[in-house]
């Protein structure tokens, strides 16, 4: 049994341009201690979409459901979607350190953008 699972339940999400997209992610435990970050794409060129502690992400809002008892909800909502936002988004758990160490990624959610 895995110590930590990062679950992105939707493989894909389709949103009309100008609307908001909700990207769901849950982690089964707070342990190991460390942040969850959201990225678009993979590898060294991936784009940081949201980090709770660092950076400024005016279009991104955490939309967790704090009542979930058996896991932690790290879902986000991205507002005012444009075609440039299309891509695959990954919810990634890090272990706290100096620097933080990437531990586990969700399977990814592909965001497609429909014309208005």
């Amino acid at each position: 049994e895995e110590e930590l699972q990062v679950i992105q339940p939707e493989k894909s999400v389709s949103v009309a341009a100008g609307e908001s997209a909700t990207l769901n992610c849950t982690a089964t435990s707070l342990i190991p201690v460390g942040p969850i970050q959201w990225f678009r794409g993979v590898g060294p060129g991936r784009e940081l979409i949201y980090h709770q502690k660092e950076g400024h992400f005016p279009r991104v809002t955490p939309v967790s459901d704090p009542t979930k008892r058996n896991n932690m909800d790290f879902s986000i909502r991205i507002s005012n979607i444009t075609p440039a936002d299309a891509g695959t988004y990954y919810c990634v758990k890090f272990r706290k350190g100096s620097p933080d160490v990437e531990l586990k990624s969700g399977a990814g959610t592909e965001l497609s953008v429909r014309a208005k």
Epitope: L30, P32, Q52, P66, R69
Partner: antibody, heavy 118, light 112 residues
């Protein structure tokens, strides 16, 4: 019914060692983060140690780091706290506690008393 | 370390009235819209019992006269109406990403 039963407490001299055990039943032990929390009349509740569900990750406050070691045996549904180089300030009731999400302590045992005195 | 200041240290409330306990953390315990502050009840000779998890969520089996509120650094536990079996000491606890996890000093609730 969830049960956490601590054992291993007792009287020990400063500098001595003790090993506390916690026997768990009534839940899927291997899925839970487990911790020890101690309580003294003077200092109230103090977090002592936490271990991840599979045992890979352990966390301690500075007050016990390097002296206490937390481990678990999921096959035996058991949690262990090895306490070395004990000090008078380690005197407390030690509670074993479970956490389904690594956040709040869902269930607590009845506690075992550790007294460090010469 | 995140220091939690819990107040008052003791509280006497009439049966049927409202009891309010506060905890203030020295820095935010919030992350992703979740507040990692929890509340426990401890009766003499017993271990603590979880009442409220993540600031405002009632643990299963806990009567709904208990409620929690707050975010970031300021949190409140409310018991309304207070019943005789609620006489106990109440503790808050933060389990944010910033170790070590810490507890408030406790509030002893008695009947006036």
């Amino acid at each position: 019914e969830v049960q956490l039963v601590e054992s291993g407490g007792g009287l020990v001299k400063p500098g001595g060692s003790l090993r506390l055990s916690c026997a768990a039943s009534g839940f899927t032990f291997s899925s839970y983060v487990m911790s020890w929390v101690r309580q003294t009349p003077g200092k109230g509740l103090e977090w002592v140690a936490t271990i991840s569900s599979g045992g890979t990750y352990t966390y301690y406050p500075d007050s016990v780091k390097g002296r206490f070691t937390l481990s678990r045996d999921n096959a035996k549904n058991s949690l262990y706290l090895q306490m070395n180089s004990l000090r008078a300030e380690d005197t407390a009731v030690y509670y074993c506690a479970s956490s389904v999400d690594g956040s709040a302590f869902d269930y607590w045992g009845q506690g075992t008393t550790v007294t460090v005195s010469s | 370390d995140i220091v939690i200041t819990q107040s008052p240290a003791s509280l006497a409330v009439s049966l049927g009235e409202r009891a309010t306990i506060s905890c203030r953390a020295s820095e935010s315990v919030d992350s992703y819209g979740m507040s990692f502050m929890h509340w426990y009840q401890q009766k003499p000779g017993q271990p603590p019992k979880l009442l409220i998890y993540r600031a405002s969520n009632l643990e299963s089996g806990v009567p709904d006269r208990f409620s929690g509120s707050g975010s970031r650094t300021d949190f409140t536990l409310t018991i309304n109406p207070l019943q005789a079996e609620d006489v106990a000491t109440y503790y808050c606890h933060q389990s944010s990403e910033n170790l070590p996890w810490t507890f408030g000093g406790g509030t002893k609730v008695e009947i006036k």
